[in-house]
């Protein structure tokens, strides 16, 4: 039960995280105009990874795409790449994890296969989350650098009476969405990896604390109280030492090769 819950929760958390990463990548508010120096502006600027927008106080918003690849800063390109890699990995991870879910049966898929798929998806989610966090952090660092540079240059060229106030940008909503989403994907990935350990057949834990072997050689495995009798035919020996309490994780509809240890 705990393994299924952990796996299911990991999947849901990762799903929310990846949806958040996609949302953050598409959002226009990666950087927003800093109004501290000009709180009375009737024009509000904000920028995303793909376009920049201007919202007039009159209610009109105009967005223009960055219709150039070569003319864009390398850092912006790097952030785009990180976010896209994060989305792609996350999407593949989601696809893999759907088939890995314990509550979903696909033919006679073995537990080891599900365990491997859970681990794979978990790693993918972790990398996806890290990509998103890295992308957002790189962009945030770029903003901080530009912010202080523009602050230093804010009143340059003040020829007499004329003031030219340079537009400064600060953190936009997308950065926070990206950080949270990346974190959720990362947590989801960790949960999937933890669930994988519980799914692996050699790590199945039984609730019983004593085992009396009746003949044959008995090998105790440190991961729990599962005994290997050395025979390949005694299916009746499987799961009779659970203290009578069965959990959903321990109920198998179909026998796999791991039922015959």
């Amino acid at each position: 039960m705990a393994v299924t819950a952990c796996q299911g929760l990991g999947f849901v958390v990762s799903l929310i995280g990846i949806a958040g990463i996609i949302a953050a990548t598409c959002m226009d508010q990666w950087s927003t105009q800093d109004l501290y120096n000009n709180p009375v502006t009737a024009v509000f600027n904000y920028q995303g990874l793909w376009r920049s927008c201007v919202r007039e106080s009159s209610g009109f918003t105009e967005c223009r795409g960055y219709f150039t690849l070569l003319g864009l800063p390398a850092m912006l390109q790097a952030v785009r790449a990180l976010m896209i890699v994060g989305i792609v990995l996350g999407a593949i991870g989601l696809l893999v994890s759907i088939f890995a879910l314990k509550c979903i049966r696909i033919g006679s898929m073995e537990d080891s296969a599900k365990a491997n798929m859970t681990l794979t998806s978990g790693i993918m989610f972790i990398v996806s989350g890290l990509c998103a966090i890295a992308g957002v952090s790189v962009f945030a660092n770029m903003l901080v650098t530009n912010f202080w540079m523009s602050t230093a240059n804010m009143y340059t060229g003040m020829g007499g009476m004329v003031q030219t106030v340079q537009t400064r940008y600060t953190f936009g909503a997308a950065l926070f969405v990206g950080w949270v989403a990346g974190g959720l994907t990362l947590i989801g990935g960790v949960m999937m990896c933890i669930a994988c350990r519980g799914l692996a057949p050699e790590e199945t834990n039984y609730k019983a604390v004593s085992y009396h072997a009746s003949g044959h050689s008995v090998a105790y495995k440190p991961g729990g109280f599962k005994a290997s009798t050395g025979f390949g035919s005694n299916t009746k020996n499987k799961k009779i030492y659970d203290g009578g309490a069965r959990t959903e994780d321990e109920v198998q509809s179909y026998p796999s090769k791991h039922d015959y240890v």
Epitope: Q33, N38, V40, T41, A42, V43, N45, Y46, Q47, S52, C53, V54, E56, S57, S58, G59, F60, E62, R64, V162, Q163, T164, V165, Q166, T167
Partner: antibody, heavy 118, light 113 residues
Framework: QIQLVQSGPELKRPGETVRISCKAS????????MHWVQKMAGKGLKWLGW????????KYAEDFKGRFAFSLDTSGSDAYLQIGNLKYEDAATYFC???????????WGQGTSVTVSS | DIVMTQSPSSLTVTAGEKVTMTCKSS????????????LTWYQQKPGQPPKLLIY???TRESGVPDRFTGSGSGTDFTLTINTVQAEDLAVYYC?????????FGGGTKLELR
């Protein structure tokens, strides 16, 4: 077509209160900010402020804070300018205007003349 | 506050002439986000409300004759009327639409000789 129709001329005594209305039609009232502009005889235009017709929040120019108040009746697409404790120097023509692209005032009311006389 | 200064305050012209009036702002009205200047020109005839002529310093409002041209950037702006006609006699105002308060210039009165 877009129209802003203002109430008729007002003759008031100093210290009294005047309320000017501006009825909008031909556009979605709650999507366009409503501005108020003062034109004194022989003088230029002065921006009083505006009301966000979506939120109802008014914004006043520094010179017009206190006695001047903007209000709305969104159900009837009406904007109001109320001037309390009238002074002689408030005698002017007041225009309401709709905000448009480029933050420009693209449609104007015909103006309401306020005369302050004892 | 941004101070808008218009010059000249009045202008006497002959019909058919080309007229140029200027508007200076104490701060730049250029918005870096879209590279547009938030300066607007209005025409006000006696007994009438102002009429929008030009926004974004150079974009003509629909229905405005093409003899009206707006130009300039940053702090210096110009309204040009090619071949002035009798119906162009009015007061012309520029307005800062970049930051609050949305200040107007003092106006330029156009009169016929």
């Amino acid at each position: 077509q877009i129209q802003l129709v203002q109430s008729g001329p007002e003759l008031k005594r100093p210290g009294e209160t005047v309320r000017i209305s501006c009825k909008a039609s031909g556009f979605t009232f709650t999507t366009a900010g409503m501005h108020w502009v003062q034109k004194m005889a022989g003088k230029g235009l002065k921006w009083l402020g505006w009301t966000n017709t979506h939120s109802g929040e008014p914004k006043y120019a520094e010179d017009f804070k206190g006695r001047f108040a903007f209000s709305l009746d969104t159900s009837g697409s009406d904007a109001y300018l109320q001037i309390g404790n009238l002074k002689y120097e408030d005698a002017a023509t007041y225009f309401c205007a709709k905000w448009g692209r480029g933050n420009a005032l693209d449609y104007w009311g015909q103006g309401t003349s306020v005369t302050v006389s004892s | 506050d941004i101070v808008m200064t218009q010059s000249p305050s009045s202008l006497t012209v002959t019909a058919g002439e080309k007229v140029t009036m200027t508007c200076k702002s104490s701060q730049s009205l250029l918005n870096s986000g879209n590279q547009k200047n938030y300066l607007t020109w209005y025409q006000q005839k006696p007994g009438q409300p102002p009429k929008l002529l030009i926004y974004w310093a150079s974009t003509r409002e629909s229905g405005v004759p093409d003899r009206f041209t707006g130009s300039g950037s940053g702090t210096d702006f110009t309204l040009t009327i090619n071949t002035v006609q009798a119906e162009d006699l009015a007061v012309y105002y520029c307005q800062n639409t970049y930051s609050y308060p949305l200040t107007f210039g003092g106006g330029t009165k156009l009169e016929l000789r």
